[in-house]
């Protein structure tokens, strides 16, 4: 906390400019008007303030806006955003995607901080759902964002937003998350033709039920082993040898290399040896 002291004669700030970097903390407190700071926030980032000086500027804004900053200030916080606590951010009402992008840019290249997580949470809750533009923005900054959401949170993602999801965005999703996302993807891509549909749905198949895998096996999709290995065990177990052979196409030979791994091991165990022998891979049930 900076002590309240009178501003020395001639030091009252008329605008936010580089001369302020020579002000001591107490001078900034005494000589910079909070309302002026709020209207000229966009200038702060161009000035090399010290961390201590930024603390003073934050303190001034906190005093001016005890209930939370207005979006006009938030959008121009820049590096001052890094000084905010999750508690500060919970007071905000961020509705503009441009504001969100501006603040994410400040944290770019770093892991998602508690501040960023709180900001995103506030933004998404304010919008009521995770729309396509928001998802596009968030996954661009944080490819793992989607998989950081709980199944409950994912349930608010509209099928239309699924078009924004790239395969790498699903890399760290667990089976429970894919269980929620798969039906949405199925709905989103339902009007596509066979081969195009498979390209789009492939990354989501870790949430697919047996009947959908059986249907895919009739479409010459040639699923690769990496995708097959991510399928739900309970969805794979009921598949026949013939269905798996059709599903994998030329990739069926890859089963041999994965025979000790789930879900291949579980599937092999539950097949008749005579059926496995038709594959000619030497798989032992």
């Amino acid at each position: 906390e900076v002590e309240k002291t009178a501003c020395p004669s001639g030091k009252k700030a008329r605008e936010i400019d580089e001369s302020l970097i020579f002000y001591k903390k107490w001078e900034l407190e005494a000589c910079v008007d909070a309302a002026l700071l709020a209207t000229q926030m966009d200038r702060v980032n161009a000035i090399p303030f010290t961390y201590e000086q930024l603390d003073v500027l934050k303190h001034k804004l906190d005093e001016l806006y005890p209930q939370g900053y207005p979006e006009s200030v938030i959008q121009h916080l820049g590096y001052l955003f890094l000084k905010m606590s999750p508690e500060d951010i919970r007071k905000w009402n961020v509705t503009s995607l441009e504001t969100l992008k501006a603040l994410l840019e400040v944290n770019k290249g770093h892991e998602m901080s508690p501040q960023v997580a709180t900001l995103i949470d506030r933004f998404v809750k304010g919008r009521g759902q995770l729309d396509k533009d928001t998802l596009d923005t968030l996954t661009a900054f944080y490819p793992g964002y989607l998989c950081s959401l709980s199944p409950e949170e994912l349930s608010s993602v509209p099928p239309s937003s699924i078009w924004a999801v790239r395969p790498q965005d699903l890399d760290t999703c667990d089976p429970r998350q894919l269980d929620v996302l798969y039906p949405k993807a199925r709905l989103a891509f339902q009007n596509m033709n066979g081969s195009e549909y498979f390209v789009k749905i492939q990354s989501f198949l870790g949430g697919a039920p047996t009947e959908d895998l059986k249907a895919l096996s009739q479409q010459n999709v040639s699923m690769d082993l990496a995708t097959f290995m991510k399928l739900r065990t309970d969805a794979v177990l009921p598949l026949t040898v013939a269905e798996v052979q059709k599903l994998l196409g030329p990739h069926v030979e890859g089963l041999k290399a994965e025979e000790r791994h789930r879900p291949v091991r579980d599937w092999i165990l539950r097949q008749r040896q005579d059926d496995l022998d038709t594959l000619g891979l030497g798989l032992q049930g």
């Epitope: 667990d174 309970d234 177990l237 791994h261 789930r262 165990l269």
Partner: antibody
Framework: QVQLQESGPGLVKPSETLSLTCTVS??????????WSWIRQPPGKGLEWIGY???????NYNPSLKSRVTISVDTSKNQFSLKLSSVTAADTAVYYC???????????WGQGTMVTVSS | DIQMTQSPSSLSASVGDRVTITCRAS??????LNWYQQKPGKAPKLLIY???SLQSGVPSRFSGSGSGTDFTLTISSLQPEDFATYYC?????????FGGGTKVEIK
């Protein structure tokens, strides 16, 4: 409610064969999704998986014990058994039988039986 | 074989504490990771399967996360009955290995 119960001698001499049986009640050893495992725990140590069997008779053993282990199943008696040959003092442990649901994990365990290898 | 390394091997905590146990696999095991709780003289009990799914009947203060090689078991607010040893286990590879265990003791 499926329950498992281990039975067998609590004392085995070195170089002999340890034999244990697990009786399944309240369910069937012929379940489609389940495999039946043996797991052991030496006194004051961690858990070591020994091997499993499926009702078809297919088995899978811990590579470090494979040469000495045989697991068999008797679907008519709703039992599965463990034989561990050429035992030494290092095989002294609590032996557990357990059901593994392929969709979850070792969800049902027997209460365990202590087997001591000593002359 | 896939090695499973748990840390810490033991920890002291108080009732109400948030406790985190980690498990690392020597190679990727996707989401095939289970967590068990064992109390002295008792058989282990399945808590979490598939890295993050809560086994039926297990209190919601237990949660699991992770995929690939790094996994975490979290107890959000430690209760008196939670003092026990916790084991991770991988069912991905046919060698079914367990971690060395983490003993959670009363501080």
């Amino acid at each position: 409610q499926v329950q498992l119960q281990e039975s067998g001698p609590g004392l085995v001499k070195p170089s002999e064969t340890l034999s244990l049986t697990c009786t399944v009640s309240g369910g069937s050893v012929s379940s489609f999704t389940d495999t039946w495992s043996w797991i052991r725990q030496p006194p004051g140590k961690g858990l070591e998986w020994i091997g499993y069997i499926y009702y078809s008779g297919s088995t899978n053993y811990n590579p470090s014990l494979k040469s000495r282990v045989t697991i068999s199943v008797d679907t008519s008696k709703n039992q599965f058994s463990l034989k561990l040959s050429s035992v030494t003092a290092a095989d002294t442990a609590v032996y557990y039988c357990a059901r593994e649901d392929a969709l979850t994990g070792f969800d049902i365990w027997g209460q365990g039986t202590m087997v001591t290898v000593s002359s | 074989d896939i090695q499973m390394t748990q840390s810490p091997s033991s920890l002291s905590a108080s009732v109400g504490d948030r406790v985190t146990i980690t498990c690392r696999a020597s190679q990727s095991i996707s989401s095939y990771l289970n967590w068990y709780q064992q109390k002295p003289g008792k058989a282990p009990k399945l808590l979490i399967y598939a890295a993050s799914s809560l086994q039926s009947g297990v209190p919601s203060r237990f949660s699991g996360s992770g995929s690939g090689t790094d996994f975490t078991l979290t107890i959000s607010s430690l209760q008196p009955e939670d003092f026990a040893t916790y084991y991770c286990q991988q069912p991905y590879d046919a060698s079914y290995t367990f971690g060395g265990g983490t003993k959670v003791e009363i501080k």
